[in-house]
Interface confidence: medium
Amino acid sequence: MRTEAQVPALQPPEPGLEGAMGHRTLVLPWVLLTLCVTAGTPEVWVQVRMEATELSSFTIRCGFLGSGSISLVTVSWGGPNGAGGTTLAVLHPERGIRQWAPARQARWETQSSISLILEGSGASSPCANTTFCCKFASFPEGSWEACGSLPPSSDPGLSAPPTPAPILRADLAGILGVSGVLLFGCVYLLHLLRRHKHRPAPRLQPSRTSPQAPRARAWAPSQASQAALHVPYATINTSCRPATLDTAHPHGGPSWWASLPTHAAHRPQGPAAWASTPIPARGSFVSVENGLYAQAGERPPHTGPGLTLFPDPRGPRAMEGPLGVR
């Protein structure tokens, strides 16, 4: 079930001939309130790019702008995961990555950003108006999700700019914190107050909202305890669904665990033991479509293409089995 809340976006005041300063002064408390609420709260950005080389191949990049540690990233298409969206990949900092077709290569780019390449052919490949969503679960901020899609008129090879358009889901209480944003905001507010403290008090005017204003759109969290914070957010509902996937498929997109780590901890014989011997990386990623689930000792930095050996935390085994780069 999906619950949608639509909230008008905050609009900047429109200064008229009279009362321009009044509007600005009136908005100060709101600016302060906004800063206080958003300071320390993370944001998720999503960038969707259509590759020039393969017209139906997409690259999705997502990042988390927050100070917490990321515990899980879920990438879905067709809407948020669990709300009509189909999971494409799940990235876990320690247990590795599992991806489903048409995802071809998912990987960590930095400690707080990931990228996902979708295969460009076949019935299950995406099309230009598909919506892609990234959900970052972090501690202590909670769960944060944003969606993005390719602009309708995008040329191949061009990308939609990173869109920090989050659906904010506060799974955990206390998403406040002192940050540079708050500091800057407070300094700026003080500066404005100092500049305008001798101006006459303005007339109160109702703030105007543009009918074209983007609307906040929030999907109800799966747990009752989750409070939804609505931020201005615009999405394009996908009318193009992969032919091989069920439209009602919240979890299921297709296929297997791929592994990822370039800095990996090797598990030796015996499921109980963990060795600290790192395996040197020879690049960043090999997609293993059979369902490899590899241990990442730490999230790998962005490295060049190539081959990586993937140890696995899931039991006593040597490198064996299919390592098919899709």
């Epitope: 489903w100 979890h251 296929s255 059979n290 899931r314 039991g315 085994r317 299919p322 899709r326």
Partner: antibody, heavy 123, light 111 residues
């Protein structure tokens, strides 16, 4: 020895819910996925969904999305599946199974299975 | 969902002869040379038992008379020579996409 021990048979009324359990031994439940498969009388096998107990991540078939809820408790090495709003169509044997662990590959091939739990929905 | 069609639905084979079971997928289940098809054996009142994984790999403990082959959309399970204990229903299962699906089953009888 790897074993998956499932809970006993259930007789339920339409509209009710049942929660099946699958307790594993002989391996660490965190090391692989646990899947649930449905088999109706004299019929074939249907994959319901699976869970990675280590992180609680679940995947499931769309047709069972509103029917089955899969969870796991790593401290007791037990996976659970709750079936809700039962109808006669839910009458079946439900198996839990371990995703095949070999080398460092997992393929959703299931190498060890529980003995099955029979669920009968009848008024 | 990928549909797996098994044939024949039932099969009677003389002891010591070859049993051949086919499984056809509605779309390819192979990628980069690897085929995500598995075979199971199920006897009445028992859970399924994994025989073959990734089209042709024999699961540990399974007799060598079982073999699997195929790629793309067409796969075959061969049992040779057939023994009395092989009487069972055999299922193919793909893992190319979610949801993994099973074939309808082939019931093998020993003559």
């Amino acid at each position: 020895e790897v074993q998956l021990q499932q809970s006993g048979a259930e007789l339920a009324k339409p509209g009710a819910s049942v929660k099946l359990s699958c307790t594993v031994s002989g391996f660490n439940i965190k090391d692989t996925y646990i899947h649930w498969v449905k088999q109706r009388p004299e019929q074939g096998l249907e994959w319901i969904g699976g869970i990675d107990p280590a992180i609680g991540n679940t995947v499931s078939a769309s047709k069972f999305q509103d029917k089955a809820t899969i969870t796991a408790d790593t401290s007791s090495s037990t996976a659970y599946m709750q079936l809700s709003s039962l109808t006669s169509g839910d009458t079946a044997v439900y198996y839990c199974a371990r995703e095949r662990v070999h080398s460092n590959t997992l393929y959703y091939a299931m190498d060890y299975w529980g003995q099955g739990t029979s669920v009968t929905v009848s008024s | 969902d990928i549909v797996l069609t098994q044939s024949p639905a039932s099969l009677a084979v003389s002891l010591g002869q070859r049993a051949t079971i086919s499984c056809r997928a509605s779309k390819s289940v192979s990628i980069s040379g690897y085929s995500y098809m598995h075979w199971y054996q199920q006897k009445p009142g028992q859970p399924p038992k994994l025989l073959i994984y990734l089209a042709s790999n024999l699961e540990s403990g399974v007799p060598a008379r079982f073999s699997g082959s195929g790629s793309g959309t067409d796969f075959t399970l061969n049992i040779h020579p057939v023994e009395e204990e092989d009487a069972a229903t055999y299922y193919c299962q793909h893992s190319r996409e979610l949801p993994p699906t099973f074939g309808g089953g082939t019931k093998l009888e020993i003559k």
